[in-house]
């Protein structure tokens, strides 16, 4: 399990407890409710991209 206050993830990534791996912060605009997005710098809101036509 991930130790508190540590991060095995590279820059631009954040640990997902749900998926048990590092995930790309770039995916947070598309899936902002993902657990790992809390560990990412504020991501642009989804409306910057036309993800829901």
């Amino acid at each position: 399990e991930q130790a508190p206050g540590t991060s095995p993830c590279s820059s631009g990534s954040s640990w997902s407890a749900d998926l048990d791996k590092c995930m790309d912060c770039a995916s947070c605009p598309a899936r902002p409710h993902s657990d790992f997005c809390l560990g990412c710098a504020a991501a642009p809101p989804a409306h910057f991209r036309l993800l829901w036509p």
């Epitope: 998926l19 790309d24 770039a26 409710h33 991209r49």
Partner: antibody, heavy 120, light 111 residues
């Protein structure tokens, strides 16, 4: 190890129907977006359909314009299976159909593909 | 729809040299934070394999001789030094909006 295995392809006459299946293992299937992408020498790689997860907008589906009203994508999270129901098939629907799993954006996991031929 | 134009359509590269493949989008696929362009490698008889995501981030297990760059509408895949196993067709793909689209591919041979 992540594995995606398509089945259901084959030869079908123009106007006919076919249902493709994809079984996924090694992945928390219910959390991943899934797509079908087809490939032919004429059109190259062509995205066909996508289904998102139940927690994101109730498993929203999206389709390429060329297959809207003809193809239906669905998923069964309890069986880790993805489906593509195809109807009113035309010769231009011929190709290799790939099942793909991804969290968002980049298409991480691809199956080996199943071949669909529409011909009389 | 966003059209992705790859160039060249094919190229022959000497072993150990640098290969450069370009992908141009018909509109920007970048925000101030991220670029939504990805690169795939496909070998004969195999499905495409993700190489680079978000323009420059190597997927896990991809050798460091692969690199990606670019933003807005112009993106580049570089391979250096090229190895024999890199013989394949390379595709770009955007995830800016639906429909997701792919480039026409660049077939690379090694001499």
């Amino acid at each position: 190890e992540v594995k995606l295995e398509e089945s259901g392809g084959g030869l079908v006459q123009p106007g006919g129907s076919m249902k493709l299946s994809c079984v996924v293992s090694g992945l928390t299937f219910s959390r991943y977006w899934m797509s079908w992408v087809r490939q032919s020498p004429e059109k190259g790689l062509e995205w066909v359909a996508e289904i998102r997860v139940k927690s994101d907008n109730y498993a929203t589906t999206h389709y390429a314009e060329s297959v809207k009203g003809k193809f239906t994508v669905s998923r069964d999270d309890s069986k880790s299976r993805l489906y593509l129901q195809m109807s009113s098939l035309r010769p231009e629907d011929t190709g290799i159909y790939y099942c793909i799993g991804y969290y968002a954006d980049a298409m991480d996991y691809w199956g080996q593909g199943t071949s669909v031929t529409v011909s009389s | 729809d966003i059209v992705l134009t790859q160039s060249p359509a094919s190229l022959v590269v000497s072993l150990g040299q640098r290969a450069t493949i370009s992908c141009r989008a018909s509109q920007s696929v970048s925000t101030s934070s991220y670029s939504y362009m990805h690169w795939y490698q496909q070998k004969p008889g195999q499905p495409p394999k993700l190489l680079i995501k978000y323009a420059s981030k190597l997927d896990s297990g991809v050798p460091a001789r692969f690199s990606g760059s670019g933003s807005g509408t112009d993106f580049t895949l570089n391979i250096h030094p090229v190895e024999e196993e890199d013989t394949a067709t390379y595709y770009c793909q955007h995830s800016w909006e639906i429909p997701w689209t792919f480039g026409g591919g660049t077939k690379m041979e090694i001499k």
